[in-house]
Amino acid sequence: MGNSCYNIVATLLLVLNFERTRSLQDPCSNCPAGTFCDNNRNQICSPCPPNSFSSAGGQRTCDICRQCKGVFRTRKECSSTSNAECDCTPGFHCLGAGCSMCEQDCKQGQELTKKGCKDCCFGTFNDQKRGICRPWTNCSLDGKSVLVNGTKERDVVCGPSPADLSPGASSVTPPAPAREPGHSPQIISFFLALTSTALLFLLFFLTLRFSVVKRGRKKLLYIFKQPFMRPVQTTQEEDGCSCRFPEEEEGGCEL
């Protein structure tokens, strides 16, 4: 026990002695922040000159203060112990560590491109003045339904599947019902529409079969040929104009 105490005391004395010797050997270590060790003046601690600072003690030089000019504006003035801090003038926002760059703001619903601010394409949104347009949330990936449609300024809002809903109320983080992921409501709606059409055609065919038996087969063939001839005509008509998103017509959307 006594031996260990002796070791501790001995170590402490060694450390204290080393610190004393170090300060005798290097008087600069005594210079506090806001000063520098002036070699020209017998290593006296001199205060940092105007527009310079030293944030740590024992420095042989002071650093030049950062100047916030142009698109940068001063957020915190330079002091003898700390550098100036900049942010960006209105209409711009900071980028990089310590606000090393300023980038132009855009409006909500836009993103910054090489050609300036452009509206978000249909199906994407940006709710901030910086960053890129991001695709709307796909609610079906979580087995949820669309509660509120998205716009270029804001995302879609997902809610519980209709089966889970008591009228009016909805859970912000509802339990996801078991549904195969990746089947969006649009795809499901498409298949439902397709099935309904097929059933209608079947019903139509059966009705015709019973009512047109006596009239012969030529007329029946003509009725069935007609619908399949129409789309050819439609595509020819559509060739005259290109299909574009509304945002594109405003000159905003680059694909």
């Epitope: 926002h93 003045k129 949330t137 990936l141 509660l147 300024e153 804001r154 997902c158 983080t173």
Partner: antibody
Framework: EVQLLESGGGLVQPGGSLRLSCAAS????????MSWVRQAPGKGLEWVSV????????YYADSVKGRFTISRDNSKNTLYLQMNSLRAEDAAVYYC????????????????????WGQGTLVTVSS | QSVLTQPPSASGTPGRRVTISCSGS????????VTWYQQLPGTAPKLLIY???HRPSGVPDRFSGSKSGTSASLAISGLRSEDEADYYC???????????FGCGTKLTVL
């Protein structure tokens, strides 16, 4: 059940520092935006800062910019608020709040509001 | 001074309907979703309405939210004594790059 437990509040002198923590349980912490909201005695709610889980993006109220730093440790299910250069006007009850809308599926949580709150920790700034 | 304007107080008698307004601008309410919070005395806030008009599960259908342009409203019908609390509207403000709360409305049930 969502549980948020704040700690680290206390008495500090003007110009001093304090680090608040918020231990989260009952939900997948790494999937949600988290905010700090404060309330000065007898006053209204004031949003302080938010941190996103996916890109680590942070935003601050103008009143605390450059002085406060929000951070999170998803492995520890903990949210932090480092408060430096504290002023008398920073004295308040600080609440930790969970946003609705799980990420990355949900792209923006702003629609869903803050659907989980802690009971708050009191910060007093006085000399 | 809050970016979102709410009346400091509102009152009503049990069973009646009361409406609390929240006014903002195009950079907040106009283009973003509004949420409403209820704070009972001495407790933490609780989410009441999200995405302008939707209620989380567990919130009675007596509470309803609506939005028009740059203003939002919270309506409470069939007023009860337990509804006596502070009510706050909130939204994202893209120009401030942050969330903003209204200054709060103290509801008194007479």
């Amino acid at each position: 059940e969502v549980q948020l437990l704040e700690s680290g509040g206390g008495l500090v002198q003007p110009g001093g520092s304090l680090r608040l923590s918020c231990a989260a349980s009952g939900f997948t912490f790494s999937g949600y935006d988290m905010s700090w909201v404060r309330q000065a005695p007898g006053k209204g709610l004031e949003w302080v800062s938010v941190i996103y889980p996916d890109d680590g993006n942070t935003y601050y109220a103008d009143s605390v910019k450059g002085r406060f730093t929000i951070s999170r440790d998803n492995s520890k299910n903990t949210l932090y608020l480092q408060m430096n250069s504290l002023r008398a006007e920073d004295a308040a009850v600080y609440y930790c709040a969970k946003h609705g809308g799980q990420k990355p599926t949900t792209k923006s949580s702003s629609a869903y509001g803050m659907d989980g709150w802690g009971q708050g920790t009191l910060v007093t700034v006085s000399s | 001074q809050s970016v979102l304007t709410q009346p400091p107080s509102a009152s009503g008698t049990p069973g009646r309907r009361v409406t609390i307004s929240c006014s903002g601008s195009s950079s907040n309410i106009g283009n973003n979703y509004v949420t409403w919070y209820q704070q009972l005395p001495g407790t933490a806030p609780k989410l009441l309405i999200y995405a302008d008009s939707h209620r989380p599960s567990g919130v009675p259908d007596r509470f309803s939210g609506s939005k028009s342009g740059t203003s939002a409203s919270l309506a409470i019908s069939g007023l009860r004594s337990e509804d006596e609390a502070d009510y706050y509207c909130a939204t994202w403000d893209y120009s401030l790059s942050g969330y903003v709360f209204g200054c709060g409305t103290k509801l008194t049930v007479l």
